[in-house]
């Protein structure tokens, strides 16, 4: 194992892979202020690159439910409500950490996993490739 | 502990709060293809609501480094490069899970925590409040 000075009050770990295997308390602490207005926004509808949200479920993952964004249009919505195909709606993606049951169906054993999720969409100027 | 039919190959847990406290392997499995172009995109520059990325560091958190988006403008960038203040650049926020060392400074004991991060920005039509 790795020589780490034992802090009094810290749980012990006899695991041979210590500290690669750790104890995690799943009682989630919420750091967010409950009144944060940005969390309850309707940007998905008001954006020039609007998106729909889809419920992605995986019972072997924690959290088992993740909402994924899918852009509604290839182009971006103009002030008159029409779609401008000279611009592109693209998903903003983020890598997030989830817990994956490992071995499968085990109730108390997980492995950290990085997954890529689409959080919303933004409107970008397309990259124009000029042919010589 | 709680009487649960033991799945062969599952680690044991004698923790009284089981299954709220679980074992987690920190050797991250990456589900994402490393060549995914969206992850290395320059949307932050090409967006009509461009953003800058700021490094948020916390040694008591896992991952210790999280990149946060901050919109560059209040308005949105038009085709001519000028900012249109009749539209708004707003951050797209997402709740993500991180591991927080608990008790503090303990190397092998964590608690799940939900934090709100800004992933990028999108351009939205403002909500106009009409005064009677």
């Amino acid at each position: 194992g790795i020589a780490i000075p034992r802090n009094s009050g810290c749980p012990n770990s006899e695991d041979k892979n210590f500290p690669r295997t750790v104890m995690v308390n799943l009682n989630i602490h919420n750091r967010n202020t409950s009144t944060n207005p940005k969390r309850s926004s309707d940007y998905y509808n008001r954006s020039t690159s609007p998106w729909n949200l889809h419920r992605n479920e995986d019972p072997e993952r924690y959290p088992s439910v993740i909402w994924e964004a899918k852009c509604r249009h290839l182009g971006c919505v103009k002030a008159d409500g029409n779609v401008d195909y000279h611009m592109n709606s693209v998903p903003i993606q983020q890598e997030i950490l989830v817990l994956r049951r490992e071995p499968r169906h085990c109730p108390n054993s997980f492995r950290l996993e990085k997954i890529l999720v689409s959080v919303g969409c933004t409107c970008v100027t397309p990259i124009v490739h000029h042919v010589a | 502990g709680i009487a649960i039919p033991r799945n062969s190959g599952c680690p044991n847990s004698e923790d009284k709060n089981f299954p709220r406290t679980v074992m987690v392997n920190l050797n991250i499995h990456n589900r994402n293809t490393s060549t995914n172009p969206k992850r290395s995109s320059d949307y932050y520059n090409r967006s009509t609501s461009p953003w800058n990325l700021h490094r948020n560091e916390d040694p008591e958190r896992y991952p210790s480094v999280i990149w946060e988006a901050k919109c560059r403008h209040l308005g949105c960038v038009k085709a001519d490069g000028n900012v249109d203040y009749h539209m708004n650049s707003v951050p797209i926020q997402q709740e993500i899970l991180v591991l927080r060392r608990e008790p503090r400074h303990c190397p092998n004991s964590f608690r799940l925590e939900k934090i709100l991060v800004s992933v990028g920005c999108t351009c939205v039509t403002p909500i106009v409040h009409h005064v009677a």
Epitope: L26, I28, S34, T35, R39, S40, D42, Y44, N45, N52, L53, H54, R55, E57, P59, Y62, P63, S64, V65, W67, R101, H105, P107 | I2, I4, P19, R20, E95, L97, K114
Partner: antibody
Framework: QVQLQQSGAELVRPGASVKLSCKAS????????IHWVKQTPVHGLAWIGV????????AYNQKFKDKATLTADKSSSTAYMELSSLTSEDSAVYYC????????????WGQGTTLTVSS | SIVMTQTPKFLLVSAGDRVTITCKAS??????VAWYQHKPGQSPKLLIN???NRYTGVPDRFTGSGYGTDFTFTISTVQAEDLAIYFC?????????FGGGTKLEIK
Amino acid sequence: QVQLQQSGAELVRPGASVKLSCKASGYTFSDYEIHWVKQTPVHGLAWIGVIHPGNGGTAYNQKFKDKATLTADKSSSTAYMELSSLTSEDSAVYYCERFLTYEGYFDYWGQGTTLTVSS
Amino acid sequence: SIVMTQTPKFLLVSAGDRVTITCKASQSVNNDVAWYQHKPGQSPKLLINYASNRYTGVPDRFTGSGYGTDFTFTISTVQAEDLAIYFCQQDYGSPYTFGGGTKLEIK
């Protein structure tokens, strides 16, 4: 404390539509999913679908896809379920319930709305 | 979809008796099972989540156990106020499904 207050009993004619409501209080409405469930004496409890008021996303049980439409109004912290083309088969008690998306379980239920479809 | 078979449908017991209700899932649902108590004229109340975790404020006479497909709910010493319908629900995956319920009556 958390409460889900559902609208009162409804008596409607076959072929009509009805909109049931579920008003949330005691928590941030946008943070949690609201699910809807149908209860009949014959078939017991059946899951209809879910709406996430924070992001507008919905998902439905295929059996109810053409029957129910879920919406939410964040300004009044109220979730709605509209049932269309009603028949006697839709007569039931309908419940809303709150789902903790991260934790993965349902913790609070409404008191139920009794819908009777009859001519 | 996953079928949750709950037994028995009815229970007639005396105060002080021990009561056991079972739910069997048609496929493994890990420990993603909850038990609820539904009293007449009230909202259903969560008693047990994660198959065996007693929810906040629930008296310790209520217990749950099981993993995979077989789940048990027990009231160690029935009290008069426990008169209700009890049902299980799997929250392993949608469509979320329910047991048929057990009506508990006190002699």
